[in-house]
């Protein structure tokens, strides 16, 4: 906190300009009018203030706006945004996407900070849902943003926003998140034809149920092994050898290299060895011929 002292004669700031870098902290406190600062915030970015000087400027704005800054000031905070705490940001009401972009730009190239996370949270809550333009903006700055949301938060994403999602945006999503996103993607892309639909839906297939995988196997999609390995194990297990062969097309040969990894390993254990042999890949571990397979889950459901 800077002590309250009178401004020396002739030092009263008439505008926010570079001469202020020569002011000591107490002079900035005494000689810069907070209302002037608020109206000329856009100039602060062009002046190489020290971090200590920025602290003083922030303090002046805090005094002027104890209930939180207006959006007209927030939009022009520039690197002063980095001085804000999550508590400061919780007082803000940010409604403009332009303001959001301006502040995300300040943090560009860095990990998502607590300040940015709070800002995004405030913005999205204010909008009521994660619309396409917002999602576009957020994933442009933070490709992993979508996967940082809880399944509950993802449920507020409208299907129309899914068009903004790129494959790399889903790289760190876990199966619970894909379970929420997949039905939205299915709805969003439902009017596309077979091959185009598969290109779009592919990144979301980690949330697909068995019946959708069976349907895809009838469409000559030639799913690659990387996508297959990300499928839900419980969705893959009921697929027959013929269905997996159709689903993977020429990529079926890749199963051999993955036979010790899930979901391939678990799927092999559920197949008849005879059927696996038809693939000619030397996959081992299937159910030997003559064994009876009891589906205990079906038995439990009936009792």
């Amino acid at each position: 906190e800077v002590e309250k002292t009178a401004c020396p004669s002739g030092k009263k700031a008439r505008e926010i300009d570079e001469s202020l870098i020569f002011y000591k902290k107490w002079e900035l406190e005494a000689c810069v009018d907070a209302a002037l600062l608020a109206t000329q915030m856009d100039r602060v970015n062009a002046i190489p203030f020290t971090y200590e000087q920025l602290d003083v400027l922030k303090h002046k704005l805090d005094e002027l706006y104890p209930q939180g800054y207006p959006e007209s000031v927030i939009q022009h905070l520039g690197y002063l945004f980095l001085k804000m705490s999550p508590e400061d940001i919780r007082k803000w009401n940010v409604t403009s996407l332009e303001t959001l972009k301006a502040l995300l730009e300040v943090n560009k190239g860095h990990e998502m900070s607590p300040q940015v996370a709070t800002l995004i949270d405030r913005f999205v809550k204010g909008r009521g849902q994660l619309d396409k333009d917002t999602l576009d903006t957020l994933t442009a700055f933070y490709p992993g943003y979508l996967c940082s949301l809880s399944p509950e938060e993802l449920s507020s994403v409208p299907p129309s926003s899914i068009w903004a999602v790129r494959p790399q945006d889903l790289d760190t999503c876990d199966p619970r998140q894909l379970d929420v996103l997949y039905p939205k993607a299915r709805l969003a892309f439902q009017n596309m034809n077979g091959s185009e639909y598969f290109v779009k839906i592919q990144s979301f297939l980690g949330g697909a149920p068995t019946e959708d995988l069976k349907a895809l196997s009838q469409q000559n999609v030639s799913m690659d092994l990387a996508t297959f390995m990300k499928l839900r194990t419980d969705a893959v297990l009921p697929l027959t050898v013929a269905e997996v062969q159709k689903l993977l097309g020429p990529h079926v040969e890749g199963l051999k290299a993955e036979e010790r990894h899930r979901p391939v390993r678990d799927w092999i254990l559920r197949q008849r060895q005879d059927d696996l042999d038809t693939l000619g890949l030397g996959l081992q571990g299937g159910i030997p011929n003559g064994y009876l397979v009891l589906d205990l889950s079906m038995q439990e459901a009936l009792s």
């Epitope: 570079e18 856009d42 100039r43 970015n45 062009a46 002046i47 190489p48 203030f49 020290t50 022009h76 520039g78 690197y79 945004f81 301006a102 730009e105 300040v106 560009k108």
Partner: nanobody, 119 residues
């Protein structure tokens, strides 16, 4: 790596001269206003000199006016501080800072170079 590196500091006698350099790597200095600052032991960091991104505008702290000159060579991605008639009170760590201006919120600080004025 994006950084500012200062050089040119050292030990000099009162009345002597030094030329400090602030070189940018990893980004182009053309678009940045530059400030030179100094910090003496136990004192607040203070602004010494300023030059606009175009080089058309310069400014100085009262304590160095007429003795220090700031300039820039954008082709060399470097800003200079020519310090003449040095006094013991000019002693300190000198560092440069770059500010990008509206629409460019990047700013950079160098680690500093030490200047000692003593007989």
């Amino acid at each position: 790596e994006v950084q500012l590196v200062e050089s040119g500091g050292g030990l000099v006698q009162p009345g002597g001269s030094l030329r400090l350099s602030c070189a940018a790597s990893g980004f182009t200095l053309d678009y940045y206003a530059i400030g030179w600052f100094r910090q003496a032991p136990g004192k607040e960091r203070e602004g010494v000199s300023y030059i606009s991104s175009s080089g058309g505008s310069t400014n100085y702290a009262d304590s160095v006016k007429g003795r220090f000159t700031i300039s820039r060579d954008n082709a060399k991605n470097t800003v200079y501080l020519q310090m003449n008639s040095l006094k013991p009170e000019d002693t300190g760590v000198y560092s440069c800072a770059a500010a990008g201006g509206y629409g460019n919120s990047s700013r950079y600080w160098g680690q500093g170079t030490s200047v000692t004025v003593s007989s």
